[in-house]
Structures are given as C-alpha cells and as structure tokens.
C-alpha cells in the first residue's frame, strides 16, 4: 500500500485558497468503513476522518472554518485537503497519513507568497529647501528590497531609509523613503523587489507642480 | 519538559518475548510519532520501527513477523513488543520522538536488554 | 531500502581543525537527512535536521550540508568534548536508516 503525491510542493498566495492532494489506491468502490485519512501540519491536527466521520473535536482551532476534506474525491482515491484564506502561519510541511488495508504517509510542503501589489505612495516638498520626500508603502511577504529609480530607470542617488514593521496577520508592512532635489513633472519609480520572477511590483511618481503635500496615489503598473 | 523513558526486563531468555514500555512527558503522542531504534554493543544504530500519531504504524521488514508496536495515547504510553527472541538481539532499545517535519530530536535513556539463558 | 554510506567510519584530528564527515544516499532525499552525536557511554543527540539546520542548543561550530543524495556534516575548530560517534539518517521513506557511523578520534 502506497500513498503518493503529484506535488510535493505548493507555493500558494496569501488569503488565496488551496488543495492539496494525496493518492492512494482504490479498487472497485471505496470502502468507508476501512478508510483513514489524517491530514497534519507539523504538530497541529487538521482533518481525522475515520471510517466516515470527521472528528473536528481534535481539529486545531487555526484551520477551524478554514480546512475540509474533499469527500468527493475519495472514491477516486484522492485524499485532497482545502484550506481557505491562507495565512502565512499555514506554511510549512504538512502530512497526509492513510490507512486502507495498508498504512503509508507523504509530506508536502507548503509556501506562502504576499506580493507587495498594493503600493500607497506620497510626495512632500520642504520649502525652505526644494527637496522632496518621496514615500513608498506596501505589504507583503517575505521581505522586498525597495530600489528607486529616476525616468530612464537608472538608480536614483538620495537619503532613504527604509522602516519595516509587521501586520496584524503577520505581513511586512514595508515604508521606504527617498529625500531628492527634484523639479515639477520629474517621474521616480519605486520597485518592490524580490528574488523570485515575477514578484516585483513598481510604483510610478510624478513630481507635481505645486510645491504642497498631496494626498497618496495609488497608480501602480 | 520533554522526556521519554523506557523500562523493560533487563534479561530474556532466547526464544522469549520483550516487552518494553515508553513513557511520555512535555508532549502529547497526538501531536507525534514514536521511534524505537536499537543498539548492539560496541555496534551502529538500527531502527526497528514507527508509530505514527494517528496510531498506524511501519516496521522494518528485518523484524515485521516478530515485532509489534501499539500506544495508549490518554497514559502517553508507547509498548515494543519483541517476539522470539535470540542472543543477537541483545541491545540498548531507545525510544525517540520522531516528528515528520524535523528529526529524531529526543531520545529515551534507553534500556538494556540482553538475551541469555 | 535507502542504504546510507557513511564515510570515513574513522578519523583522527586535533584540536582546533576542521573535519568533514560525508554521507552517501542510494535514493534521492531532498533535504530529510539528520546527523547525530554519539558520545561514549551516552544516548545518541540529534546535531542537524532537513540536512542543514542546527537543533537547538548545538553549537554553531557544526553545520551540514547537500541535498538529494549527497551530505556533509563539517566540524570547525575541533574541541574536545567533539570526542564522538557522528551518525547520518535518511527521513525521507521508511524503513529510516543510518549510516554506519564516524567514530572521531583526537591526535
């Protein structure tokens, strides 16, 4: 008896959904009365589902209203588990455990990603001096490099700082500043940068003309 | 915190059964599996078999006709149960925490069985 | 059945060098490969889980390494109490199995 996994990894989105799946074999028609399946991450029960019934007394109250077993698969012999809502706190390596006539176990790991999308973005100008403060502000997961670039891409000289904090659920809420003499209808790009492909996201700034404090943009691209 | 602690006969007869028994503190054996691994002496270390939280177990197969593992979660209690046994299973048999997602990470004191007339 | 060739089963170093043990695997095992410390007339300790994490505890002198089928456990700036039995494990499908250890000797 042999369980088997068509991926053992998954790299999901943060607050999106997700199925994980386990194989096990099935012949003829499924007998529920010998079937146990035990889905587990880490040290924290998810799914026990023996002989036809789910025991949620033991579930752990992180995946409470969030996790189900696909019943409907397992005459197909798929032991497929649904969360809901993902969190960060769901990442990590998580274990189908199967007992059909024979016993077998697999592991899956589990990543969460949280684009930083959603950038805010804010421009000042101190009037003693001409200089702007340019503000970047995003959340995501994990941590992104904020590079900031001038009209023809090239990097930007200035005085920045970064400050990085977390959400309630456990995101990087990351600020990033940049101080540049600067004149009207100067464009600035801030880039969220992470490593993996696809993953960074870029703000677009535009010096306006008069030298007051704007309320923030939200254009992005 | 942690700790594991096996107690067993000391001495068996060849041809004699082996019982030990592994008592759990500082976790819940809902939340872990159990490993019992064995060490003749002066030589490496050999795993016997597994069980697992949701009470299935796998054994390697050099001892599947002869050995069974049951637990009782509510006394966090884990039972090694060795049948016919011969002089070459003389050993040190631990008992070890064994989390899917991590290591062996601890282990009993063990407990030393030889096999002797 | 994973085998796990463990290489040297012997080696004499002295105190203060680097010493590296080697672990072959005949099956690929991702990153499920542990190392364990076995000091004379002692219980055997866990050193490194998932091929390169330090358990907690361990000192930072020890470090692992490799995935798939080849694994190095490295001890810097050998001290004495490294005295010890090193022993690799494969988690990756049971049966589990180890290999035959590397018994550290200081010159």
């Known amino acids: 008896f042999t369980v088997t996994v068509p991926k053992d990894l998954y790299v999901v989105e943060y607050g999106s959904n997700m199925t994980i799946e386990c194989k096990f074999p099935v012949e003829k028609q499924l007998d529920l009365a010998a079937l146990i399946v035990y889905w587990e991450m880490e040290d924290k029960n998810i799914i026990q589902f023996v002989h036809g019934e789910e025991d949620l007394k033991v579930q752990h109250s992180s995946y409470r209203q969030r996790a189900r077993l696909l019943k409907d698969q397992l005459s197909l012999g798929n032991a497929a588990l649904q969360i809901t809502d993902v969190k960060l706190q769901d990442a990590g390596v998580y274990r189908c455990m199967i007992s059909y006539g024979g016993a077998d176990y697999k592991r899956i790991t589990v990543k969460v990603n949280a684009p930083y999308r959603k950038i805010n973005q804010r421009i000042s100008v101190d009037p003693a001096t001409s200089e702007h403060e340019l503000i970047c502000q995003a959340e995501g997961y994990p941590e992104a490099e904020v590079i900031w670039t001038n009209s023809d891409h090239q990097p930007v000289s200035g005085k920045r700082s970064v400050t990085t904090s977390r959400t309630e659920g456990m995101l990087l809420n990351v600020t990033s500043s940049l101080r540049v003499n600067a004149t009207a209808n100067d464009v600035f790009y801030c880039t969220f940068w992470r490593s993996q492909p696809g993953q960074n996201h870029t703000a677009e700034l535009i010096i306006p003309e008069l030298p007051a404090t704007h309320p923030p943009q939200n254009r992005t691209h | 915190q942690v700790q594991l602690k096996e107690s067993g006969p000391g001495l068996v007869a060849p041809s004699q059964s082996l019982s030990i028994t592994c008592t759990v503190s500082?976790?819940?054996?809902?939340?872990?599996?159990i490993s019992w691994i064995r060490q003749p002496p002066g030589k490496g270390l050999e795993w016997l078999g597994a069980?697992?939280?949701?009470?299935?177990?796998n054994y390697n197969s050099a001892f599947m006709s002869r050995l069974s593992i049951s637990k009782d979660n509510s006394k966090s209690q884990v039972f090694l149960k060795m049948n016919s046994l011969q002089t070459d299973d003389t050993a040190i048999y631990y008992c070890v925490r064994d989390p899917y997602y991590y290591a062996m990470d601890y282990w009993g004191q063990g407990t030393s069985v030889t096999v002797s007339s | 059945d994973i085998q796990m060739n463990q290489s040297p089963s012997s080696l004499s170093a002295s105190l203060g060098d680097t010493i590296t043990i080697t672990c072959h695997a005949s099956?690929?095992?991702?990153?499920?490969l542990s190392w364990y410390q076995q000091k004379p007339g002692n219980i055997p300790k866990l050193l490194i889980y998932k091929a390169s994490n330090l358990h907690t505890g361990v000192p930072s002198r020890f470090s692992g390494s490799g995935s798939g089928t080849g694994f190095t456990l490295t001890i810097s700036s050998l001290q004495p109490e490294d005295i010890a039995t090193y022993y690799c494990q494969q988690g990756q499908s049971y049966p589990r199995t180890f290999g035959g250890g590397t018994k550290l000797e200081i010159k």
């Open positions: 500082g976790f819940s054996l809902t939340s872990y599996d």
């Open positions: 099956q690929n095992l991702n990153v499920w």
């Open positions: 069980i697992w939280t949701g009470g299935g177990t």
